[in-house]
């Protein structure tokens, strides 16, 4: 029951996380114009991974896509790649995890197969989450670097008034969505990996059997029918060996490494 709950919760958390990663990737507000120490303007600028936007004070917004591919900064291309890889891995992970869910029965799929699929999807979610966190962090680092560079490039204008040469940009909403979504996907992946341990069948699934000899003390040796007591042949001992070890496991016994010795 706990395994099913852990697996289900892991799936739901990952699903929310991947939806968040997709949302963050599509959002335009990755970087927003820093309004601190900025001349009062009627327009507000913000940029995403795919397009740049200008919003008027009236609320009217105009956006333009980055049509060139070669002219874009390498860092932006890297962030795009990380986010897309995260989405693709997450989507595959979701697909795999649907079939791995314990509450969903598909044909005669064994628990071992479900366990493997759960582990696979869990690893995919972890990598997906890490890709998203890495992508957002690279972009954030780029923003911080540019922010302080533009601050360092300050010049003193006429009358000793200090202003920056370039407009400074700060963290947009998409960065926070991306960080949270990446974290959720990562947590969901860890939960799936934990659930996998509970789903995997045990290596040895035996029930302990104690043998009771009627009469003499019997030493049981797994060597043919020689259940020796120190006196010649003993039919009673043979009988004990043959039929005395009946358990419910005999109805449906699981093969293990001991069966092939």
């Amino acid at each position: 029951m706990a395994v099913t709950a852990c697996q289900g919760l892991g799936f739901v958390v990952s699903l929310i996380g991947i939806a968040g990663i997709i949302a963050a990737t599509c959002m335009d507000q990755w970087s927003t114009q820093d309004l601190y120490n900025n001349p009062v303007t009627a327009v507000f600028n913000y940029q995403g991974l795919w397009r740049s936007c200008v919003r008027e004070s009236s609320g009217f917004t105009e956006c333009r896509g980055y049509f060139t591919l070669l002219g874009l900064p390498a860092m932006l291309q890297a962030v795009r790649a990380l986010m897309i890889v995260g989405i693709v891995l997450g989507a595959i992970g979701l697909l795999v995890s649907i079939f791995a869910l314990k509450c969903i029965r598909i044909g005669s799929m064994e628990d071992s197969a479900k366990a493997n699929m759960t582990l696979t999807s869990g690893i995919m979610f972890i990598v997906s989450g890490l890709c998203a966190i890495a992508g957002v962090s690279v972009f954030a680092n780029m923003l911080v670097t540019n922010f302080w560079m533009s601050t360092a490039n300050m010049y003193t204008g006429m009358g000793g008034m200090v202003q920056t040469v370039q407009t400074r940009y700060t963290f947009g909403a998409a960065l926070f969505v991306g960080w949270v979504a990446g974290g959720l996907t990562l947590i969901g992946g860890v939960m799936m990996c934990i659930a996998c341990r509970g789903l995997a069948p045990e290596e040895t699934n035996y029930k302990a059997v104690s043998y009771h000899a009627s009469g003499h003390s019997v030493a049981y040796k797994p060597g043919g029918f020689k259940a020796s007591t120190g006196f010649g042949s003993n039919t009673k001992n043979k009988k004990i060996y043959d039929g005395g070890a009946r358990t419910e496991d005999e109805v449906q016994s699981y093969p293990s490494k001991h069966d092939y010795v």
Partner: nanobody, 123 residues
Framework: QVQLVESGGGLVQTGGSLRLSCAAS????????MGWFRQAPGKEREFVAG????????DYADSVKGRFTIARDNAKNTVYLQMNSLKPEDAAIYYC????????????????WGQGTQVTVSS
């Protein structure tokens, strides 16, 4: 690499009008935000007006609001600055500038610049 060439400057009397033009060599002109800046002798280069990619949003400096109008013709790869009710303090070298992603009032945000055209206002 966008090359910008300004024209239309000259001598005009106070209260007069002038229309400046800025022609761009690049066929991808519509993917640039365009701006007009001016620099009077001994002063900083200052923002005059700016216009977004398709012309949907325009921004003006407070000193020119209501007197100057910025417009663009993407088919002709040209941006215009219509200047009315000119004052002596409007006299300066007017520069056309292009920038791909942001409409701002800071000169450092603009990557491409023209050579400038002189506007003189006599009283």
């Amino acid at each position: 690499q966008v090359q910008l060439v300004e024209s239309g400057g000259g001598l005009v009397q106070t209260g007069g009008s002038l229309r400046l033009s800025c022609a761009a060599s690049d066929s991808t002109f519509s993917s640039y935000i365009m701006g007009w800046f001016r620099q009077a002798p001994g002063k900083e280069r200052e923002f005059v007006a700016g216009i977004t990619w398709s012309g949907g949003i325009k921004d003006y400096a407070d000193s020119v609001k209501g007197r100057f109008t910025i417009a663009r013709d993407n088919a002709k790869n040209t941006v215009y600055l219509q200047m009315n009710s000119l004052k002596p303090e409007d006299a300066a070298i007017y520069y056309c500038a292009a920038n791909a992603i942001q409409l701002t009032r800071r000169s450092g945000d603009y990557a491409y610049w023209g050579q400038g055209t002189q506007v003189t206002v006599s009283s």
